[in-house]
């Protein structure tokens, strides 16, 4: 069954954590649907964003952080491993120095830590997707 | 009760028709939710778009048409009558020479016809909103 979108979950992250998302774009790529994943510092949606990951399907991916309410330097990628009309599985792994984003098992994007991942308190998944699975897994100590 | 989003309805338009939409942004304006309304020439979402109306809440509105699969000259407005966190009522009236867009009863945008409104077969309302009302009214002859 489908999860509600926007999907918001209280979460704690650290090196070894992985966030897994399975979903499908709600429109054809010609119409440029979006997917957005935000790692927030508070349970409030207005809070700062440690890692902002936004896909404009078929066009580009932008990554950024929002610090003290202001967007910082945007990182853009034209890499587009998502398939038009197809389900995707996205996993974001917390490495010691960066986030590694895998799409359908393929390493696709990285984003260097600007704020420590331990600052994350909430993950939000939203925009133009249907969501079938969400998980946060923690590496065994 | 809420209507499904994306919301797609078969529609015929002509001078005197009005499309009315009532809804609410799904996120605070800081997070830049979108609203999009597209008047399509076919029941298929890949079809051409006679009138494309996209709000990036808190930032700007863009209007355009998609003809033979290609986007044409974009019209942009910084006018932002929508209120953060508030319900809105949007009405798009078909005038002889243009579309007139009213927001909460206030004339806010216009877009000159590029393709005759009689070419419209479907209206789609989508992106980051909850939708409580959709109506197409026809002026009595």
């Amino acid at each position: 069954s489908l999860l509600p979108v926007p999907y918001t979950e209280a979460a704690s992250l650290s090196t070894g954590s992985t966030v897994t998302i399975k979903g499908r774009p709600l429109a054809c790529f010609l119409n440029e649907p979006y997917l957005q994943v935000d790692f927030h510092t508070e349970m409030k949606e207005e809070s700062d964003i440690v890692f902002h990951f936004q896909v404009c399907f078929g066009r580009r991916v932008v990554m950024n952080s929002r610090e003290y309410g202001a967007w910082k330097q945007q990182v853009e990628s034209k890499n587009m491993p998502f398939q038009d009309g197809q389900e995707f599985e996205l996993s974001i792994s917390v490495l010691p120095d960066k986030y590694q984003v895998m799409v359908n098992g393929q390493s696709s994007y990285t984003f260097d830590h600007r704020i420590k991942p331990e600052a994350v308190k909430m993950v939000q998944v939203w925009r133009d997707i249907s969501l079938t699975k969400f998980n946060v897994s923690y590496l065994k100590r | 009760s809420l209507l499904p989003v994306p919301y797609t309805e078969a529609a015929s338009l002509s001078t005197g028709s009005t499309v009315t939409i009532k809804g609410r942004p799904l996120a605070c304006f800081l997070n830049e939710p979108y609203l999009q309304v597209d008047f399509h020439t076919e029941m298929k979402e890949e079809s051409d778009i006679v009138f494309h109306f996209q709000v990036c809440f808190g930032r700007r509105v863009v209007m355009n048409s998609r003809e033979y699969g290609a986007w044409k000259q974009q019209v942009e407005s910084k006018n932002m009558p929508f209120q953060d966190g508030q319900e809105f009522e949007l009405s798009i009236s078909v005038l002889p020479d243009k579309y007139q867009v009213m927001v909460n009863g206030q004339s806010s945008y216009t877009f000159d016809h590029r393709i005759k409104p009689e070419a419209v077969k479907m209206v789609q309302v989508w992106r980051d909103i909850s939708l409580t009302k959709f109506n197409v009214s026809y002026l009595k002859r």
Partner: nanobody, 121 residues
């Protein structure tokens, strides 16, 4: 108020079977995932099995092929069928659900109180 109540634990001989149940009750808007964890004396709590909203599952390597997790969406209940039990399966088994309670804007994790499973001859 959301509550998770486990049942089905007990004493069983090696090679035997048990079926654990965990029922989530209260005003629940949506369930994201439900899982079983266990904690043996002097050890850390570890994931045993988890079932997601798309009905996909994941298992700890040590229980693969012996344990089966399933879920009744209608009853907000998760089950753990444990076959070919071994003494090293002895632990307190806890249920965890990530769900959104009515009136809340976010999903959060909830734990049950645990049920004891002892595998011994």
């Amino acid at each position: 108020q959301v509550q998770l109540v486990e049942s089905g634990g007990g004493l069983v001989q090696p090679g035997g079977s048990l079926r654990l149940s965990c029922a989530a009750s209260g005003s629940i808007f949506s369930i994201s995932r439900m899982g079983w964890y266990r904690q043996a004396p002097g050890k850390q709590r570890e994931l045993v099995a988890i079932i997601f909203s798309d009905a996909s599952t994941d298992y700890a390597d040590s229980v693969k092929g012996r344990f089966t997790i399933s879920r009744s969406n209608a009853k907000n209940t998760v089950y753990l069928q444990m076959n070919s039990l071994k003494p090293e399966d002895t632990a307190v088994y806890y249920c965890k659900s990530v769900l959104r309670a009515a009136g809340y804007g976010y999903f959060n994790q909830y734990w049950g109180q645990g049920t004891q499973v002892t595998v011994s001859s």
